[in-house]
Interface confidence: low
């Protein structure tokens, strides 16, 4: 027999199927031009010393073979003795290790068997009523197909599904959508209505995320506030990566889970923009304000569950950076300016009250004054910090107030509002004999002492009513008692106490009269 012809003789090996699991499979035969045909197959198992024979039986019952040698692809013409216009049955026999292995048979009409392509190019994936819808453009000159899909998850083998007949320029398929695991899909096509036509090879993998993106399991830490009034937010634990099926590992479009960071600055509510969304990989710098931070996971089907954390305000205070002067027209604050054209947000809140009661004011962009200070003034009528109580003040600055991540903390401090000099006057001043020439003076703590860093010192004044001599004694802000010594018996004295702040002298308490009785010896 000539090599180009199908040989109508017995093949050169005994006819005995070994029944082994290995062997030839996936036989496909097509017309590849007007007069040429090709059959190809796959061989599973060791290939050394294997010879392949393509067998063909005509409708008349006559059978022939082509010797392919070690190749798994063979071409022949319409002159090779195989009927191409009538139905034939083809299979492969592989002779190896003194035994024959046979492939499943394929029965077809060769002339009408066109090589079908799998879906090529892009496969558009969308969600439709809880299912996946895949859509692609029909390969050129191949309208009219049966389509199958197969799919698997990271933990399950391939499962086969049917897309049904297709007869349009675009083809589509409805497939199952998993809630919580990624899937890999592949599609294949074959000629519609052609008996025994071969399936195309499988398409490239289509990687589909779960309907619900995985909830991000992350932890944050926030650094100390730096000299520039900003602190770095850092990610302590990366989000867990989605487990992917085998064909989706590495470069897998479609299964991407995007994690975004949503910042909500709780402090300074009068600023223009309170929230900002960033990529999780780009960790921002924050001011010392309080924030809520949410991590939002999303995939091609939309957002999933998010996790929210609260980052408390940095409460480190600068006791001397803020200067406050109270005049007849109102109050002015001065603090070291940050830079040219800065917008400042001044926020104040009564100490010990709910965080929801914070009030704030936004300044117009301002340059430093000649002394390098920035200022903020308000009138008494405005009522700002007008009550005689302790306020916690924070000043934030930004050259771009519309950008949430560019705010920095200038300072945080305490301020006693209203008429601090009068309100801070110590009460309940009492005098007790201590010895023959000394007394102990006690008083109740000033209201200013409730305001950390505001009370600079107490001053106790003692006046000798005879000589009109006055002595003043400074007392630490943490003390509410002092011993006055060197007093003379029988002389009348008055004592007063006042509480001073760094910028205000206090009002003296009501004079308290006392004298040390003259001791008469027996």
């Amino acid at each position: 027999c000539r090599t180009s012809e199908c040989c109508f003789q017995d093949p050169p090996y005994p006819d005995a199927d070994s029944g082994s699991a290995s062997g030839p499979r996936d036989l496909r035969c097509y017309r590849i031009s007007s007069d040429r045909y090709e059959c190809s197959w796959q061989y599973e198992g060791p290939t050394a010393g294997v010879s392949h024979f393509l067998r063909c039986c005509l409708s008349s019952g006559r059978c022939c073979y082509f010797a392919a040698g070690s190749a798994t692809r063979l071409q022949f013409s319409d002159q090779a003795g195989v009927s191409v216009l009538y139905t034939v049955t083809l299979w492969v026999e592989s002779w190896a290790r003194n035994q024959t292995e046979k492939s499943p048979e394929v029965t077809l009409q060769l002339y009408n068997s066109v090589k079908y392509e799998p879906p090529l190019g892009d496969i558009k994936v969308s969600k439709l009523a809880g299912q996946l819808r895949m859509e692609w453009e029909t390969p050129d000159n191949q309208v009219g197909a049966e389509v199958q899909f197969r799919h698997r998850t990271p933990s399950s083998p391939w499962k086969l599904g049917d897309c049904g007949p297709q007869d349009d320029d675009t083809e589509s398929c409805l497939c199952p959508l998993e809630m919580n695991v990624a899937q890999e899909f592949q599609l294949r096509r074959r000629q519609l209505g052609s008996q025994g036509s071969s399936w195309s090879k499988w398409s490239s993998p289509v990687c589909v995320p779960p309907e619900n993106p995985p909830q991000p399991q992350v932890r944050f830490s926030v650094e100390q506030l730096g000299q520039d009034g900003r602190r770095r937010l850092t990610l302590k634990e990366q989000p867990t990566q989605l487990e992917l099926p085998e064909g989706c590992q590495g470069l897998a479009p479609g299964t991407e889970v995007t994690y975004r960071l949503q910042l909500h600055m709780l402090s300074c509510p009068c600023k223009a923009k309170a929230t900002r969304t960033l990529h999780l990989g780009k960790m921002p710098y924050l001011s010392g304000a309080a924030y809520n931070v949410a991590v939002i996971s999303s995939n091609q089907f939309g957002p999933g569950l998010n996790q929210t954390w609260h980052i408390p305000a940095d409460t480190h205070t600068e006791p001397v950076a803020l200067n406050i002067s109270v005049g007849t027209n109102g109050t002015t604050m001065y603090w070291p300016a940050r830079a040219q054209s800065m917008t400042y947000c001044i926020e104040w809140q009564p100490v010990g009250q709910d965080g929801g009661l914070a009030t704030c004011s936004l300044t117009a962009p301002q340059d430093p004054d000649p002394a390098g200070m920035a200022t903020y003034s308000w009138s008494r009528e405005s009522g700002a910090m007008g009550q005689e109580k302790c306020y916690y003040i924070t000043i934030f600055a930004s050259a771009h107030p519309e950008k949430l991540t560019l705010w920095s903390t200038v300072l945080s401090t305490y301020h006693f509002g209203g008429n601090a000099s009068a309100a801070g006057t110590p009460h309940h001043v009492s005098v007790k004999n201590h010895s023959l020439d000394s007394v102990s003076v006690d008083w109740a703590p000033s209201l200013l002492s409730t305001c950390p860093g505001v009370l600079k010192e107490y001053v106790v004044r003692c006046r000798d009513e005879d000589s009109k001599q006055v002595s003043e004694h400074p007392v630490q802000p943490t003390e509410t008692q002092v011993t006055l010594s060197g007093l003379r018996a029988g002389v009348a004295y008055t004592v007063q106490v006042r509480a001073d702040t760094a910028w205000l002298r206090g009002v003296w308490s009501q004079p308290q009269r006392f004298s040390i009785e003259v001791q008469v010896s027996d």
Epitope: L120, G121, D122, L251, A252, P253
Partner: nanobody, 127 residues
Framework: QVQLQESGGALVQPGGSLRLSCVVS????????IGWFRQAPGKEREGVSC????????IYSDSVKGRFTISRDNAKNTVYLQMNSLKPEDTGVYYC????????????????????WGKGTPVTVSS
């Protein structure tokens, strides 16, 4: 007849940069996915990066994310791969490949089953 011609491969020191070019000719469709693949000695060919024609969507393998950038110049029918911070493990033959596609979707079929391939350009990263 679709042809892809790569150029720009060279010997470069670790930490260095290279720019690969791929000129496409004979392809008329406006819609396609094009990408760079590489094959290290004794290893399988792997995807590096792909770009879609219609909207410029890009995708990168984990090993090159942040270091490599894919871009295209439609007027010149050229796709580029800018490779920065090169490492010895980036050594290999870099191939350009193209596949037909009509739509912008989640990602392009950036796999080694693309239809048209160039002959490759060698990149060696060594000190």
């Amino acid at each position: 007849q679709v042809q892809l011609q790569e150029s720009g491969g060279a010997l470069v020191q670790p930490g260095g940069s290279l720019r690969l070019s791929c000129v496409v000719s004979g392809f008329t469709s406006d819609y396609f996915a094009i990408g760079w693949f590489r094959q290290a000695p004794g290893k399988e060919r792997e995807g590096v990066s792909c770009i879609g024609s219609s909207d410029g969507s890009t995708i990168y393998s984990d090993s090159v994310k942040g270091r490599f950038t894919i871009s295209r110049d439609n007027a010149k029918n050229t796709v580029y791969l800018q490779m920065n911070s090169l490492k010895p493990e980036d050594t290999g033959v870099y191939y350009c490949a193209l596949d037909r596609g009509r739509r912008t979707i989640i990602g392009y079929a950036c796999y080694a089953t693309m239809k048209y391939w160039g002959k490759g350009t060698p990149v060696t990263v060594s000190s």
